[in-house]
């Protein structure tokens, strides 16, 4: 009669929970039985983000910190079942916590838009295209961002128009701009639940051009034209 290690009821335990659950919420549980009928003590291994705790008697798993789907989902940890008393033999199983997305990331620019410029003086109103993104999950369809100017004072000089759910066009309303950098604030709304808004800045330079690029004194890089 050889003492055997505890046996988990499943190789992998899986649970699904919203990423915004309150700290202390039960997010799942595991069960194992000992062939000799001994009690089981449960513990976690590999909880690298410090998100979970397990009740060592019942095998229930609770959140102990805010969860974040954007940090990676599913979140995988190992569960160890050790027999209480006896030879303290143990077995290992997996617990996978699938985090359901909550709209908790405001929109932002999809890339670095430094270096945008128009050749000065403008011969006609100009425009440039920019792209927005966010880190939330967009099932079945892409993001549906809406775009507007970040402050009323910009409306005399600029207008923003939506191209699609992720792209918009920033256009000048006239040609009378000074030879300098303008910082254009754009408000991007993700239309989610709850809707989140990001205000981003697009730095646009009006500069003298040489062969289609901004002329800079020696030692400065040439920038490419973006209209």
């Amino acid at each position: 009669d050889v003492n055997e290690a505890p046996q988990f009821s499943q190789h992998v335990f899986q649970a699904k929970v919203s990423e915004d659950v309150a700290i202390g919420t039960k997010v799942g549980n595991v069960t194992a039985k000992d062939p000799e009928g001994l009690d089981i003590s449960y513990s976690l291994r590999g909880d690298t983000r410090g998100w979970l705790k397990i009740d060592h008697v019942t095998g229930e798993i609770f959140s102990v910190a805010p969860l974040d789907r954007e940090a990676g989902s599913p979140y995988r940890v190992q569960v160890v079942a050790t027999e209480v008393g006896g030879s303290s033999l143990s077995s290992v199983s997996e617990f996978h916590l699938i985090l359901m997305d909550v709209n908790d990331n405001p929109p932002r620019l999809a890339k670095d838009y430094t270096g945008l410029f128009f050749c000065h003086p403008l011969s006609a109103p100009g425009s440039l295209i920019f792209e927005a993104t966010d880190d939330d999950q967009h099932l079945f369809r892409g993001p549906h961002f809406t775009f507007s100017l970040g402050s009323g004072s910009l409306q005399n000089d600029w207008e923003v128009s939506k191209i699609n759910g992720t792209h918009a066009r920033l256009s000048t309303r006239h040609t009378e701009f000074e030879e300098r950098e303008y910082v254009v604030l754009i408000r991007i709304n993700d239309g989610g639940r709850p809707p989140l808004e990001g205000i981003v800045s697009l730095p646009v330079t009006f500069c003298s051009c040489v062969e289609g690029s901004c002329f800079r004194p020696a030692g400065h890089k040439h920038h490419h034209h973006h209209h």
Partner: antibody, heavy 117, light 108 residues
Framework: QVQLVQSGAEVKKPGASVKVSCKAS????????IHWVRQAPGQGLEWMGA????????SYAQKFTGRVTMTVDTSTNTAYMELSSLRSEDTAVYYC??????????WGQGTMVTVSS | DIQMTQSPSSLSASVGDRVTITCRAS???????LQWYQQKPGKAPKLLIY???NLASGVPSRFSGSGSGTDFTLTISSLQPEDFATYYC?????????FGQGTKLEIK
């Protein structure tokens, strides 16, 4: 026979800590979980938490998390429960109990802890 | 947390009576982890019944337990003088373990 023998009554001032011991005899402490349950005068039973003496794993009731510490000394077959930041409502009889399959089959005789200024 | 509610809170009965105490859980409890304890004044609780219906060692057969889900009962078929005490149900299906508020059984 199997028994759990607890330390004697304690009188403490508010804000102090108390450490109650529970010595197992007739069996090896590491063979079972040890639980702590308290009972305020004239009141019912309240589970405080549990410890597995084999590796020190513990589970505390949310109400006591941060104030209670359960430990064991396997060399003396003794479990301990320390409760800090005592207040008058912590006046109670504190019991240790051994569990098997989550039922408490052996209980200590209880330790009266009085918190009074 | 699972709340355990016992009824009645107190009960007067005579020797030889059949007595039933009920325990209702606020959510479903595994019958494997439902216990009953007896406590006499100045003494530690004593295990009577474990896993809903199993008699603990040395407990007389006049005690019995039954139930499932959220409703459980403790029955004493014929009260004896030594049975006058306070009775508690306990669940450990889910953490934290919780007890009923107790039922005090007194002599009529």
């Amino acid at each position: 026979q199997v028994q759990l023998v607890q330390s004697g009554a304690e009188v403490k001032k508010p804000g102090a800590s108390v450490k109650v011991s529970c010595k197992a005899s007739g069996y090896t402490l590491t063979s079972n979980n040890i639980h702590w349950v308290r009972q305020a005068p004239g009141q019912g039973l309240e589970w405080m938490g549990a410890i597995y003496p084999g590796n020190g794993d513990n589970s505390y009731a949310q109400k006591f998390t941060g104030r209670v510490t359960m430990t064991v000394d396997t060399s003396t077959n003794t479990a301990y429960m320390e409760l800090s930041s005592l207040r008058s409502e912590d006046t109670a009889v504190y019991y240790c109990a051994r569990s098997f399959r989550r039922y408490f089959d052996v209980w200590g005789q209880g330790t009266m802890v009085t918190v009074s200024s | 947390d699972i709340q355990m509610t016992q009824s009645p809170s107190s009960l007067s009965a005579s020797v030889g009576d059949r007595v039933t105490i009920t325990c209702r859980a606020s959510s479903s409890v595994s019958s494997s982890y439902l216990q009953w304890y007896q406590q006499k004044p100045g003494k530690a609780p004593k295990l009577l019944i474990y896993s809903t219906s199993n008699l603990a060692s040395g407990v007389p057969s006049r005690f019995s337990g039954s139930g499932s889900g959220t409703d459980f009962t403790l029955t004493i078929s014929s009260l004896q003088p030594e049975d006058f005490a306070t009775y508690y149900c306990q669940q450990y299906s889910s953490s934290p373990s919780t007890f009923g508020q107790g039922t005090k059984l007194e002599i009529k």
